[in-house]
C-alpha cells in the first residue's frame, strides 16, 4: 500500500548551474494524497533557513506529482546559495533536502562556460 505521507522530491546535494540575468524556475516536487499541503521556500544562511516572503511562486500539476515553483525573474548574483522547501502537513513540518544554485555573473565572466564545464566543476562558479 502506498504511503500517504507528504514527500518532497529534492535530491540531496543537488545543484543547478545558472546565469545571472536569465529567468529560472526552482521546483519542489510534492507528493501528497488528499489535500495539498501548504509549501514554502527558504534560503539557508549558515544553519538557519530564512523563509522567502513576497516572492513569485506558483503550482504546476502533473499526473503523480505537484510542483511548487520559486520564480527568479531574473536570476541575480545574490541568489547564489542553498534553498529548501518545506510542507506543512497535519501540524507537522516536512523539510526537503537543500538544493544549491551556483550563479555565474555574466558581467564578470569573460564568456559563458559550457554546461559540461559548469556541471563537472561547480566550484569554479560564482560564489
Amino acid at each position: 500500500k502506498e504511503s500517504c505521507d507528504v514527500q518532497l522530491y529534492i535530491k540531496r546535494q543537488s545543484y543547478h548551474s545558472i546565469f545571472a540575468g536569465d529567468p529560472f524556475k526552482l521546483e519542489c516536487p510534492v507528493k501528497y494524497c488528499a489535500h495539498r499541503p501548504q509549501v514554502t521556500w527558504c534560503k539557508l544562511n549558515g544553519t538557519t533557513c530564512v523563509k522567502l516572503e513576497g516572492r513569485h511562486t506558483s503550482w504546476k500539476q502533473e499526473k503523480n506529482l505537484s510542483f511548487f515553483i520559486l520564480h527568479f525573474e531574473p536570476v541575480l548574483p545574490s541568489d547564489n546559495g542553498s534553498y529548501r522547501c518545506s510542507a506543512n502537513f497535519l501540524s507537522a513540518i516536512i523539510e526537503s533536502h537543500s538544493t544549491t544554485l551556483y550563479v555565474t555573473d555574466v558581467k564578470s565572466a569573460s564568456e559563458r562556460p559550457s554546461k559540461d564545464e559548469m556541471a563537472s566543476r561547480p566550484w569554479l562558479l560564482y560564489s
Epitope: Q7, Y9, I10, K11, R12, Q13, S14, Y15, H16, S17, L44, S82, E95, H97, S98, K115, D116, A119, S120, P122
Partner: antibody
Amino acid sequence: EVQLQQSGAELVKPGASVKLSCTASGVNIKDTYMYWVKQRPEQGLEWIGRIDPANGYTRYDPKFQDKATVTADTSSNTAHLQLSSLTSEDTAVYYCAVNDGYFEYFDVWGAGTTVTVSS
Amino acid sequence: DVVMTQAPLTLSVTIGQPASISCKSSQSLLDSDGKPYLNWLLQRPGQSPKRLIYLVSKLDSGVPDRFTGSGSGTDFTLKISRVEAEDLGVYYCWQDTHFPRTFGGGTKLEIK
C-alpha cells in the same frame, strides 16, 4: 527490485580508451545518483565520480578528473564510464552503483567490469 | 579529502562469537541536513560490495539484526553479535557526505 547490469570484460592496449556501460532496471535513473568505483587487484575501493542523470551534472574525485568521464542516457536507463589514455595502473574492476537520490532507500552495486590494460 | 581509517586490518573470529570494527573519519560527516552519511559495505569473496548499513545505524532490508551500526561525530563502529560463516569477507566504511567520497581501507573478517 533495483538491479544493475554491467558490460563485459575489456582487454585494451596502453594509450587507448574504453567505454563501460551500466544499465539499471527496477528504477528510473532520473530519480537516482549513479556512481563509479575502482578496485585494483587485491586492493580497496576508490570513488571515481557520480552523475545526476536528471540533468547530467557530474562530480569527480580530482585524481580521476582527466582520466574518467561519466555520462548517462535516460532513454536507455544507462550510465557510462569512459576511461582515456589507459595505462597498467588502470587495470582494475570498475563497479557502477546506484542510490536513491531522495531518501536513501537503496544503494545497489553492479557485478563489476574487469578492464585489463596490456600490450 | 576526508580520510577514513578502519581498524583492525584483519579480524579472526570463531563462529558464534562477537566481532567489532572501528571506523574513524578525519572530519565530521554531518551533511547540511544534520545527518551523518556513514555507510558500511560487505564485499564477500569474489562478489561486488553490498550495503549493510546507512546513516550510521540503519540496516538495509534483508540484513540480519545481528549487525549493529553506532557512533557519532568522527567515531563509528560496526558490531556483529554472533558471527556466522556467511559474514566472512571485507567490510568497508565510507562517507557519502563530502566530495570526493572516500572509503576506509577495509577490514577482512576471517573465520577461525
